[in-house]
């Protein structure tokens, strides 16, 4: 392991479409692959009238946008589908929306998924 880097070996897995896809709805997904590539966790979700609906969670491929992010945070302003990625085992268990705004002070909106 490289000093100061969180290696991702497993992520929380979730699939909202699990019945149709014939997968587990939730679980732990091992992240493996090329030794020279970094691995990350991700989460995607929607905000339907203030209610959080998780779409997918799992392992994400080597992505510089995820490097050294210990927390899973979406920074885009009001996307239709929220996305975040992070490094570290199960770092996608919790995710949050923290939009980067130009003028106003950003406010954190942490999201803790409720168990199904």
């Amino acid at each position: 392991a490289i000093l100061g880097r969180s290696e991702t070996q497993e992520c929380l897995f979730f699939n909202a479409n699990w019945e149709k896809d014939r997968t587990n709805q939730t679980g732990v997904e091992p992240c493996y692959g090329d030794k020279d590539k970094r691995r990350h966790c991700f989460a995607t979700w929607k905000n339907i009238s203030g209610s959080i609906e998780i779409v997918k969670q799992g392992c994400w491929l080597d992505d510089i946008n995820c490097y050294d992010r210990t927390d899973c945070v979406e920074k885009k302003d009001s996307p239709e589908v929220y996305f975040c990625c992070c490094e570290g085992n199960m770092c996608n268990e919790k995710f949050s929306y923290f939009p980067e705004m130009e003028v106003t002070q950003p406010t954190s909106n942490p999201v803790t998924p409720k168990p199904p």
Epitope: G33, G58, W60, L61, E80, F83
Partner: antibody, heavy 120, light 107 residues
Framework: EVQLLESGGGLVQPGGSLRLSCAAS????????MSWVRQAPGKGLEWVSS????????YYADSVKGRFTISRDNSKNTLYLQMNSLRAEDTAVYYC?????????????WGQGTLVTVSS | DIQMTQSPSSLSASVGDRVTITCRAS??????LNWYQQKPGKAPKLLIY???ILQGGVPSRFSGSGSGTDFTLTISSLQPEDFATYYC?????????FGGGTKVEIK
């Protein structure tokens, strides 16, 4: 070196059947989801079907659902596509492709393809 | 199914030109967008995944951007070997779909 080699293509009459095979080497086959993608002559790419590494989860395009069956034999490192009730519009080059481990699941290695012609 | 619309369907350009290809999804697909290059008679080759991440071994003149519904593939300085057809693909939905392709031809 990752290699994917398709076989089994050929000329078949409408309503007929064909089974395509894809022999994989150079990687741990069971770790990877595999897919079939086709390309009709002079047309674009069309995803056909995918199967998880264990073979337990399968996915199909609506255009082939109920007619095509994807499967794999992990002991032989081989992917299959059983095609039944073939139609003229199924005429295409069929590519076997390996899916990356982890989202967004790009197809990182492709075979050279096998041509399926459905004609009377 | 999610529809992927590429534009233009074809373009003519010269070596050294900056080329931009766009791909639009019929609904938000976050960053679940991949780009492929295909040369005549050959299998497609992965260029970019996750909307912006360059696949290993792909020259840095290729870049991708976008999220949600609008995506762009840019070739900063077109080389002779870049004349090919380019396809976007969404993997957000289990029913994967490709764009119709953009053929990049020599002017």
């Amino acid at each position: 070196e990752v290699q994917l080699l398709e076989s089994g293509g050929g000329l078949v009459q409408p309503g007929g059947s064909l089974r395509l095979s894809c022999a994989a080497s150079g990687f741990t086959f069971t770790d990877y989801a595999m897919s079939w993608v086709r390309q009709a002559p002079g047309k674009g790419l069309e995803w056909v079907s995918s199967v998880s590494g264990s073979g337990s989860s399968t996915y199909y395009a609506d255009s082939v659902k109920g007619r095509f069956t994807i499967s794999r034999d992990n002991s032989k490192n081989t992917l299959y596509l059983q095609m039944n009730s073939l139609r003229a519009e199924d005429t295409a080059v069929y590519y076997c492709a390996r899916g990356s481990i982890g989202a967004p699941w790009p197809l990182d290695y492709w075979g050279q393809g096998t041509l399926v012609t459905v004609s009377s | 199914d999610i529809q992927m619309t590429q534009s233009p369907s074809s373009l003519s350009a010269s070596v050294g030109d900056r080329v931009t290809i766009t791909c639009r999804a019929s609904q938000s697909i976050s960053r679940f967008l991949n780009w492929y290059q295909q040369k005549p008679g050959k299998a497609p080759k992965l260029l970019i995944y996750g909307a912006s991440i360059l696949q290993g071994g792909v020259p840095s003149r290729f870049s991708g951007s976008g999220s949600g519904t609008d995506f762009t593939l840019t070739i900063s300085s077109l080389q002779p070997e870049d004349f090919a057809t380019y396809y976007c693909q969404q993997t957000y939905s289990t029913q994967w779909t490709f764009g119709g392709g953009t053929k990049v031809e020599i002017k």
